[in-house]
Interface confidence: low
């Protein structure tokens, strides 16, 4: 606010006042009178730039008059009291109320004193973020969506992620006149590595004290990615039982595991137990290629592993999963 002038009456008011759509707002306006200065205020007037006539007048003897009596009210001015506070309350703010207003004091003997105030009409947006569930497409697709509904002015949306990706933002008029709905899509080539990771949508708006952060957990549907673990190329005759595990990552979860060999069904020494395969002790060398086939709702994938059981005494540390 401007400092009061020295030796002169000065009108004090903020240069800008924010108000919310549908709410009420007070446009503050005061007359600063230096000590020992004799000032008589005969009238308070509010006018809007670009419009002829006054929107609100408070006269020292006639009291208040308004262009829209249901929407305007002098907050502090009273008949019979010194007119020093011209603050005006506006009810039911509309988009078209945004603009420049002049607050004017008619004083004697100093003459008229005025100040301009910019009324800014804001609407606080509602923000939502949601995942766009996708399959492996091989090309960039929207994987998350962030919507800021009914903001005035439009909200700013940005994305934060260590996965890369590209924002694509658009705007459409909001439900209430003068408001804007902003939609931002976060676009990336889907991969299994992205599934379950988070991206954050940041929404900034001048009605927020701080940016709103909305986290989206990404979903990528993909067929199983399969590998077999538990074999160290170091299995010997006479060794205890060993276990192989069919490791599968997929979304949705695997629905079935099927073990076989390149020659057909499993040999007697191999017993399937879901994702695991129990290898029993054998008495002659073996060289077999095992296959684990994993199914989920999107398809089936398999992994192969060639297992050799060799002659020769097992060393102290040979084999894995030994009992």
């Amino acid at each position: 606010w401007p400092p009061p002038g020295t030796g002169d009456v000065v009108v004090q008011a903020p240069t800008q006042v924010p108000g919310f759509l549908g709410d009420s707002v007070t446009l503050p306006c005061y007359l600063q009178v230096p000590n020992m200065e004799v000032t008589h205020v005969s009238q308070l007037t509010w006018a809007r730039h670009g419009e002829s006539g006054s929107m609100a007048v408070f006269h020292q003897t006639q009291g208040p008059s308004y262009s829209e009596s249901k929407r305007l009210e002098f907050v502090a001015a009273r008949l019979g009291a010194e007119l020093r506070n011209a603050s005006l309350r506006m009810f039911g703010l509309r988009v078209e109320d945004e603009g420049n207003y002049t607050c004017l004091f008619v004083t004697f003997p100093q003459g008229s004193r005025s100040v301009d105030i910019w009324l800014r009409v804001l609407a606080k947006p509602q923000n939502t973020a949601e995942v766009q569930k996708v399959q492996l497409t091989g090309e960039p697709v929207p994987m998350a969506r962030c919507v800021s509904t009914g903001g005035r002015p439009p909200a700013q949306i940005t994305w934060h992620s260590d996965l890369g990706g590209m924002p694509n933002t658009s705007q459409v008029p909001g439900f209430l006149s003068g408001t804007v709905t902003v939609t931002s899509l976060w676009i990336l080539v889907p991969s299994s590595q992205v599934d379950g990771k988070n991206v954050t949508c940041k929404v900034e708006h001048e009605s927020f004290e701080k940016p709103q952060l909305l986290t989206v957990n990404l979903t990528v549907y993909y067929p199983p990615e399969v590998s077999i673990s538990g074999y160290d190329n170091n299995w010997y005759l006479g060794q205890n039982e060993a276990t192989l595990t069919c490791d599968a990552r997929s979304n949705p979860e695997p629905t079935g595991y099927n073990w076989s060999t390149t020659m057909g069904p499993l040999p007697p020494f191999a017993v399937a137990q879901g994702a695991q395969l129990l290898i029993r002790p054998v008495d002659k060398p073996i060289n077999t290629t095992l296959i684990c086939n994993v199914t989920n709702a999107l398809g089936a994938r398999q992994a192969e592993l060639t297992v050799q059981v060799k002659e020769g005494p097992p060393s102290e540390h040979s084999g894995i999963s030994r009992n």
């Epitope: 002015p153 700013q156 260590d162 590209m166 694509n168 933002t169 705007q171 804007v180 954050t200 701080k210």
Partner: antibody, heavy 114, light 107 residues
Framework: EVQLQQSGAELVRPGTSVKLSCKAL????????MHWVKQTPVHGLEWIGT????????AYNQKFKGKATLTADKSSSTAYMELSTLTSEDSAVYYC????????WGQGTTLTVS | DIQMTQTPKFMSTSVGDRVSVTCKAS??????VVWFQQKSGQSPKALIY???YRYSGVPDRFTGSGSGTDFTLTISNVQSEDLAEYFC?????????FGAGTKLELK
């Protein structure tokens, strides 16, 4: 009042690196992205990239990947941009700014590679 | 990358004139455009954001308009302090890109 204080002018040799700084005052440093912009008479204003100091997440213009590295020190509310393997093409004025909802830019750092 | 083609490069004007600068985006950027003013030897200062919203403290002789691909900055009643270079910038997509600038000079 928002202020962005950038480090002073630099005169450096080709092939070396330089680290420019931008100290933010008057707002919550971790809440707003810090963008870096290059300005030359030939190419005008070019966006280099941005860092979100709160999370450390960065985004770069492909053109400046490998050339610029953005970092931020939350404790001192300072953003940094390191430019590597400098050539005369890197001579420019470099600005930092929280760009979108704020009007404020740093005063700029003039870099001369010669 | 989105190209922002700004015209004209130079513009001669007199105090009190009305001038317009245009920016054309190579693809739809909704209303995600900022206009900057840069005076000689100074940093850029943002005037308008979201294509048509004035920043607080910017005189109302500066007006922004447009959406999609075509944007305009209009200065009505040009003042001597408005002599500067003006840039547009889109923030719909990374990388953010700027127009090449329009220099406003006195006739």
């Amino acid at each position: 009042e928002v202020q962005l204080q950038q480090s002073g002018a630099e005169l450096v040799r080709p092939g070396t690196s330089v680290k420019l700084s931008c100290k933010a005052l008057g707002y919550t440093f971790t809440d707003h992205e810090m963008h870096w912009v290059k300005q030359t008479p030939v190419h005008g204003l070019e966006w280099i990239g941005t860092i979100h100091p709160g999370s450390g997440v960065t985004a770069y213009n492909q053109k400046f990947k490998g050339k610029a590295t953005l970092t931020a020190d939350k404790s001192s509310s300072t953003a940094y941009m390191e430019l590597s393997t400098l050539t005369s093409e890197d001579s420019a004025v470099y600005y930092c700014t929280p760009l979108w909802l704020r009007r404020d830019w740093g005063q700029g750092t003039t870099l001369t590679v010669s | 990358d989105i190209q922002m083609t700004q015209t004209p490069k130079f513009m001669s004007t007199s105090v009190g004139d009305r001038v317009s600068v245009t920016c054309k985006a190579s693809q739809n950027v909704a209303t995600n455009v900022v206009w900057f003013q840069q005076k000689s030897g100074q940093s850029p200062k943002a005037l308008i954001y979201s294509a048509s919203y004035r920043y607080s403290g910017v005189p109302d002789r500066f007006t922004g308009s447009g959406s999609g691909t075509d944007f305009t900055l209009t200065i009505s009643n040009v003042q001597s302090e408005d002599l500067a270079e003006y840039f547009c910038q889109q923030y719909n997509n990374y990388p953010l890109t700027f127009g090449a600038g329009t220099k406003l000079e006195l006739k």
